[in-house]
């Protein structure tokens, strides 16, 4: 969490951003909040990116002002206009790409004063893993697949019964480049699995951590998966 304060002249206002991550090929949100003002026409929001000459986005007098917008962001950005009055200056970014990563500044002017805060935006790819029993294998084998990751993640297997066990000797992980030549498909195979046990396939890079669980019994197979973004620090 980054909290910024205004400087000189008018009073300063508190602006708060949260470091976040964008999944390439999806819309992303850059979070920013500020002390609200009672009059929308008195609020100015400017989003800037380090190393970019033009503005990322500007909202003033109750509407978008995009005449100074950098070409890189043309047609891709929006604030939540109906939420600005309550102090939400978050930016929606369409079709996030690797090149969108960097340091952004959320700069706010209201009748109460000015303030700004920086935000570190990471970009990459992350997806839910799916764990299945590989019936084609000669022994009991589990196959963990996740379609899109970047940067290359680590894959670790764990089991409920053998907690703390190292499965690196009985697993094999491969990374296959996807057609757009950026993201990769992750496939990890775990051999010699035992029945009546819950196994977890954990995929992690510096942006996200995802886990796929599978419980195999004689009568049924239960699956569960979840994903969490890392480094959501506020400023």
């Amino acid at each position: 969490l980054i909290i910024g304060f205004g400087i000189s002249g008018r009073h300063s206002i508190t602006v708060t951003t949260v470091a976040s991550a964008g999944n390439i090929g999806e819309d992303g949100i850059l979070s920013c909040t500020f002390e609200p003002d009672i009059k929308l026409s008195d609020i100015v929001i400017q989003w800037l990116k380090e190393g970019v000459l033009g503005l990322v986005h500007e909202f003033k007098e109750g509407k978008d002002e995009l005449s100074e917008q950098d070409e890189m962001f043309r047609g891709r950005t929006a604030v939540f206009a109906d939420q600005v009055i309550v102090g939400n200056a978050s930016l929606r970014l369409k079709n996030v790409q690797l090149t969108d990563a960097g340091t952004y500044k959320c700069y706010i002017i209201t009748s109460k004063g000015k303030g700004n805060a920086n935000l570190e935006y990471k970009t990459g790819a992350f997806s839910m893993p799916e764990v299945n029993v590989d019936y084609n294998a000669s022994s009991e084998t589990l196959r963990c697949e996740a379609p899109r990751w970047f940067p290359q993640p680590t894959v670790v297997w764990a089991s409920q019964v053998d907690q703390g066990a190292n499965f690196s000797e009985v697993s094999n992980t491969s990374f296959e480049l996807n057609s757009e030549n950026v993201t990769m498909k992750v496939v990890s195979v775990l051999y010699n699995v035992t029945i009546n046990n819950t196994y977890s396939c954990m995929i992690e890079n510096d942006i996200a951590k995802a886990t796929g669980d599978i419980k195999v019994t004689e009568s049924e197979i239960k699956r569960r998966s979840h994903l969490q973004l890392l480094n959501s620090k506020a400023s």
């Epitope: 999944n23 390439i24 090929g25 978008d64 995009l66 047609g75 950005t77 929006a78 057609s179 757009e180």
Partner: antibody, heavy 116, light 109 residues
Framework: EVQLVESGGGLIQPGGSLRLSCAAS????????MNWVRQAPGKGLEWVSV???????DAADSVKGRFTISRDNSKNTLYLQMNSLRAEDTAVYYC??????????WGQGTTVTVSS | EIVLTQSPGTLSLSPGERATLSCRAS???????LAWYQQKPGQAPRLLIY???SRATGIPDRFSGSGSGTDFTLTISRLEPEDFAVYYC??????????FGQGTKLEIK
């Protein structure tokens, strides 16, 4: 040259299924938001479905649960699987690329007629 | 759901005249996510304007877009014979993800 070419349309009975294809050339389908948009005879444009660069999909309420958008990255082709077709699905179906700033490339359209 | 309402439904003008087409949204739309298209009979739509005011590649400068919030305008400064067609505004970003106006037919007077 950047181009989209649809195929697969035709006359189908209510309740039937059809799969539309859209072959792309000159750009990589998986790097863009790819859409299906339809136009009923004499009517306006209606958005049907999207597949994001990530592979996630979304669809209009009118087709959710019946139509499925997908892509084959190796063939650089977009698909629309249409099941449980109704008379009101009769339309020209266009595939269109969203290059971040609008639907800038459209196919020529393929006609789907649902009638008994 | 954001509804886009275009007016007039039909606009009858002569070549050389100025055309002003309106698109009104039921709630605020980001200027970045507002586009205009032209469609001629038997053809696919063609992107004219994106980001409310930026001309797409190859679009003549007689076409211009303006507006913000809930009111957007497409202006054709001097009508050419090939400009007579149906025009649609479109927004991105809400549910449904893409919404089109019902269209304005620009016909020769």
């Amino acid at each position: 040259e950047v181009q989209l070419v649809e195929s697969g349309g035709g006359l189908i009975q209510p309740g039937g299924s059809l799969r539309l294809s859209c072959a792309a050339s000159g750009f990589i389908v998986s790097r863009n938001y790819m859409n299906w948009v339809r136009q009923a005879p004499g009517k306006g444009l209606e958005w049907v479905s999207v597949i994001y660069g990530s592979g996630r999909t979304d669809a209009a309420d009118s087709v959710k649960g019946r139509f499925t958008i997908s892509r084959d990255n190796s063939k650089n082709t977009l698909y629309l699987q249409m099941n449980s077709l109704r008379a009101e699905d009769t339309a020209v179906y266009y595939c269109a690329r969203d290059a971040d700033y609008g639907l800038d490339v459209w196919g020529q359209g393929t006609t789907v007629t649902v009638s008994s | 759901e954001i509804v886009l309402t275009q007016s007039p439904g039909t606009l009858s003008l002569s070549p050389g005249e100025r055309a002003t087409l309106s698109c009104r949204a039921s709630q605020s739309v980001s200027s970045s996510y507002l586009a205009w298209y032209q469609q001629k009979p038997g053809q696919a739509p063609r992107l004219l304007i994106y980001g409310a005011s930026s001309r797409a590649t190859g679009i003549p400068d007689r076409f211009s877009g303006s507006g913000s919030g809930t009111d957007f305008t497409l202006t054709i400064s001097r009508l050419e014979p090939e400009d007579f067609a149906v025009y649609y505004c479109q927004q991105y970003g809400s549910s449904p993800l893409y919404t089109f106006g019902q269209g304005t037919k620009l016909e020769i007077k």
